[in-house]
Interface confidence: low
């Protein structure tokens, strides 16, 4: 399919690099529209003038940050994963909510609760959720700390989810935990408020169980008090989900090729 | 680029399936020899008569078991990973070794030590190691148990490595932990005996720290005693490494294409 | 997915994983691999229609795009997606060796 | 690896990742994607010589095999190995949306 062009790649059929680039560009035009399930570019008639809203930019930047830290392995991509995922975020319930009252006294843990009605507004059906990440902004940390994440399970029990070894650091850094399964469960259940606990890792021998790491949104040194929340940077859930209307479209065309 | 041909694959140059199969078979001939860095099939003149030795078959079966449980994702394959890896195994040091004496009394942990001279015999240089797995045969388990694996670090301290949530089960099952980094460290250091600890996960609240799971090789109910070892099925390290002579060959041809 | 479950049970004409069992003795004339006697190597075959060009009605191709050219390649190609390793036993002189060969078995394919 | 570090700094003629920056406005004529303005899509290009046939001297090809036809394909093909997603911001009516598109950026290639 190829023809020679100056000093370009030598191939058994020498390659026209420009043609390949052009074909790739045209394929990307199709790929983007197809991933968004758009038959043509959306009309820009109603787009409000001026820059993008702050919150949208913050969300876009959160998503970009995730990408930057992501391993670049190609995963096999089921059909549902091929299509674009809408990204939303749900901030942690503010700490003056009564749910926090019974968890005030611990030095080894901090607690983060989320309003499931906000989650359901963002993701109306559990099956639509393709990824949920709990994002925490950790402030500087003087010593290495091993932390564990738990999910609130029943009345007063907690289920272990995952752990992380945090290296000492002079600068703030976002931590991200994959909590897709947990959020999917929450969306399936009737509860109003659900939560996580971040704890120091307690080994069976050691008795030094203090959570040393400072998470933005919880006043340093008074973790038991759970005071001032620093705006947009308090813990949040970053959600990636197939929009409902796109999912319905997918369902109706579930035939193969 | 494709054109139809009865019920065969539709292609523009209709596909001769037999030709493609033949080409794939020839390519596999090259692939296998190339992965083993053999210029031609090895001579069979000195092969001893009779079946394969028991130990070799056990090792082959261990490797096959690993494959069966392995996720079938293609990983990006650096040059060193393209070539075949020799598989060996090193059994845990028998429990009458004095190293175990100081770890007798714990109900929340079992200990597994390995002779580094045996490891070095199998893998002469740390860089040759491409994977090390700690394999444990867990016997039936009545209740769910959350276990943690630690590495012996300094005199009496242990470094957390990973954890596993074990579901109840009526039949024995191999557990596998990736300990490549740890074994690479051991190969780099001068120690004679190195070890792991498998412990119950201890949360900061809960005080029920008993290790419920039975690991083959440790007498049930008397974990503190660490008595009879059941032959080949006691814990072992499964090692995958580039043979030294193949590695030297690789080093000398480290130019690109 | 274009995997063995789907492809081996269908008459899919486009990109799919195809069955291929290799018997070391019969197909390669080799007696030196002692275990296994052969293996299911499989292979990928079938067209990946480009299906996106400026004269195609956008709406018609959307549903097909993700299978035929999900990577938006200039010339999509039917290639392995999921691969598995193969352990073998052979002798070097009198010494038996167990070696693992990476990425030998094709489990599924994709247009890339 | 045939990644951006190696390929962008070499004159590799065989399979490699090639630079391609797409400016949504200039290259696609699109003004509807508000962020980003464009992205490094890149693409895979270059031959994967077959390099194994019965009349080839075995020993000569061993060193090359793992790059030219590591998957032992009947017709090896230069395709993406590592891919990354792309988040975008666009409007549907008056409502801004942030969406993530999977597998949009080619970071490295392989012969498969």
């Amino acid at each position: 399919d190829y023809k020679d062009d100056d000093d370009k790649l030598s191939t058994s059929k020498t390659i026209d690099m420009e043609l390949v680039k052009r074909k790739r560009i045209e394929a990307i035009r199709g790929q983007i529209l197809s991933k968004l399930r758009l038959a043509s570019p959306p009309s820009q008639g109603e787009v409000p003038p001026g820059p993008l809203p702050e919150a949208v930019l913050a969300l876009y930047n959160s998503t970009r940050d995730r990408v930057a830290g992501e391993s670049a392995e190609p995963e096999p991509e089921p059909e549902a994963d091929y299509y674009a995922k809408e990204v939303t975020r749900v901030l942690m319930v503010e700490t003056h909510n009564e749910i926090y009252d019974k968890f005030k006294q611990s030095t080894h843990s901090i607690y983060m609760f989320f309003n499931t009605s906000e989650l359901r507004e963002a993701v109306p059906e559990p099956v639509l959720l393709s990824r949920a990440e709990l994002r925490l902004l950790r402030l500087k940390l003087k010593v290495e700390q091993h932390v564990e994440l738990y999910q609130k399970y029943s009345n007063n029990s907690w289920r272990y989810l995952s752990n992380r070894l945090l290296a000492p650091s002079d600068s703030p850094e976002w931590l991200s935990f994959d909590v897709t399964g947990v959020v999917r469960q929450w969306l399936s259940r009737g509860g109003e408020i659900e939560g996580f606990r971040l704890s120091a890792h307690c080994s069976c021998d050691s008795r030094d169980n203090t959570l040393q790491v400072d998470i933005n949104g919880f006043t340093t040194g008074r973790r038991g008090d759970l005071a001032t929340i620093h705006g947009m940077n308090r813990p949040f859930l970053l959600l990636m989900a197939t929009p409902l209307e796109r999912a319905q479209h997918l369902q109706s065309s579930r035939h193969r090729r | 680029d494709y054109k139809d041909d009865d019920d065969k694959l539709s292609t523009s140059k209709t596909i001769d399936m037999e030709l493609v199969k033949r080409k794939r078979i020839e390519a596999i001939r090259g692939q296998i020899l190339s992965k083993l860095r053999l210029a031609s099939p090895p001579s069979q003149g000195e092969v001893p008569p009779g079946p394969l030795p028991e130990a070799v078959l056990a090792l082959y079966n261990s490797t096959r078991d690993r494959v069966a449980g392995e996720s079938a994702e293609p990983e990006p394959e650096p040059e060193a990973d393209y070539y075949a890896k020799e598989v060996t195994r090193v059994l845990m040091v028998e429990t009458h070794n004095e190293i175990y004496d100081k770890f007798k009394q714990s109900t929340h942990s079992i200990y597994m030590f390995f002779n580094t001279s045996e490891l070095r015999e199998a893998v002469p240089e740390p860089v040759l190691l491409s994977r090390a797995e700690l394999r444990l045969l867990r016997l039936k388990l009545k209740v769910e148990q959350h276990v943690e694996l630690y590495q012996k670090y300094s005199n009496n301290s242990w470094r957390y490595l990973s954890n596993r949530l074990l579901a109840p089960s009526d039949s024995p099952e191999w557990l596998s932990f990736d300990v490549t980094g740890v074994v690479r460290q051991w190969l780099s250091r001068g120690g004679e005996i190195e070890g792991f600890r498998l412990s119950a996960h201890c949360s900061c609240d809960s005080r029920d720290n008993t290790l419920q799971v039975d690991i083959n090789g440790f007498t049930t109910g008397r974990r503190g005693d660490l008595a009879t070892i059941h032959g080949m099925n006691r814990p072992f390290l499964l090692l995958m490494a580039t043979p030294l002579e193949r590695a030297q060959h690789l080093q000398s041809s480290r130019h690109r294409r | 997915a274009l995997d063995t479950n789907y492809c081996f049970s269908s008459t899919e004409k486009n990109c799919c994983v195809r069955q291929l069992y290799i018997d070391f003795r019969k197909d390669l004339g080799w007696k030196w691999i002692h275990e296994p006697k052969g293996y299911h190597a499989n292979f990928c075959l079938g067209p990946c229609p480009y299906i996106w060009s400026l004269d195609t009605q956008y709406s018609k191709v959307l549903a097909l795009y993700n299978q035929h050219n999900p990577g938006a390649s200039a010339a999509p190609c039917c290639v392995p997606q999921a691969l598995e390793p193969l352990p073998i036993v052979y002798y070097v002189g009198r010494k038996p060796k167990v070696e693992q060969l990476s990425n030998m078995i094709v489990r599924s394919c994709k247009c890339s | 690896a045939l990644d951006t570090n190696y390929c962008f700094s070499s004159t590799e003629k065989n399979c490699c990742v090639r630079q391609l920056y797409i400016d949504f406005r200039k290259d696609l004529g699109w003004k509807w994607i508000h962020e980003p303005k464009g992205y490094h899509a890149n693409f895979c290009l270059g031959p994967c010589p077959y390099i194994w046939s019965l009349d080839t001297q075995y020993s000569k090809v061993l060193a090359l095999y793992n790059q030219h036809n590591p998957g032992a394909s009947a017709a090896p093909c230069c395709v993406p190995q590592a891919l990354e997603p792309l988040p975008i911001v666009y409007y549907v009516g008056r409502k801004p949306k942030v969406e993530q598109l999977s597998n949009m950026i080619v970071r490295s290639c392989k012969c498969s």
């Epitope: 045209e26 | - | 060009s53 400026l54 004269d55 | 200039k26 290259d27």
Partner: antibody, heavy 122, light 108 residues
Framework: QVQLVESGGGVVQPGRSLRLSCAAS????????MNWIRQPPGKGLEWIGY???????YRANWARGRFTISRDNSKNTLYLQMNSLRAEDTAVYYC????????????????WGQGTLVTVSS | DIQMTQSPSSLSASVGDRVTITCQAS??????LAWYQQKPGQPPKLLIY???TLESGVPSRFSGSGSGTDFTLTISSLQPEDFATYYC??????????FGQGTKVEIK
């Protein structure tokens, strides 16, 4: 004002080379894809090729061996290098800028220069 | 490469006439077609793109139609300034940028 001015034309012998220039003004040249088109005397228009902002060029099949398109954004100038010229290359050579309309960006020629005449003759 | 065939190659008409010029592509180009007007000694001027979209500033007596392979340029009521040569151009991608041979519209 917005304009394109071609220069560098003239009489040249067969087999020789010539470089045409196109000076752009009144718009942000570095942001535009640019085209070369020619018109032999008394005949129709022939598209030669275009260059995007990044410097990547696309050319008509017939132009690939002998014609090279380049640009110098710092000088707001587009170039056409023509080698091994033949009598049939005699034409008025135009540079043109693409339009800004969605999906019709590169090759719909919205703004044209006045052209420069190249005569290949011995 | 795509070939563009215009017909007729020339035509004579009077002021006020309705004039139709056709253009045929050797393969489908969707609606990726433009029409240009060229007067002697001047560069071409864009009239229509996307087969039927009028370029701004072009009088509404000019219209275009068609898709796929067959296209038409119509001048509903010919004016004195419309006597010129008209070219169609395909542009579905860089491989298929091509002009028709032109149609000369002369005064009858």
């Amino acid at each position: 004002q917005v304009q394109l001015v071609e220069s560098g034309g003239g009489v040249v012998q067969p087999g020789r080379s010539l470089r045409l220039s196109c000076a752009a003004s009144g718009f942000t040249f570095s942001s535009e894809a640019m085209n070369w088109i020619r018109q032999p005397p008394g005949k129709g228009l022939e598209w030669i090729g275009y260059i995007y902002t990044s410097g990547t060029t696309y050319r008509a099949n017939w132009a690939r061996g002998r014609f090279t398109i380049s640009r110098d954004n710092s000088k707001n100038t587009l170039y056409l290098q023509m080698n091994s010229l033949r009598a049939e290359d005699t034409a008025v050579y135009y540079c043109a800028r693409g339009t800004h309309i969605y999906d019709h960006y590169y090759w719909v020629h919205h703004l044209w220069g006045q052209g420069t005449l190249v005569t290949v003759s011995s | 490469d795509i070939q563009m065939t215009q017909s007729p190659s020339s035509l004579s008409a009077s002021v006020g006439d309705r004039v139709t010029i056709t253009c045929q592509a050797s393969q489908s180009i969707s609606t990726y077609l433009a029409w240009y007007q060229q007067k002697p000694g001047q560069p071409p001027k864009l009239l229509i793109y996307a087969a039927s979209t009028l370029e701004s500033g072009v009088p509404s007596r000019f219209s275009g139609s068609g898709s796929g392979t067959d296209f038409t340029l119509t001048i509903s009521s010919l004016q004195p300034e419309d006597f010129a040569t008209y070219y169609c151009q395909s542009y579905s991608d860089g491989d298929s940028v091509g002009f028709g041979q032109g149609t000369k519209v002369e005064i009858k």
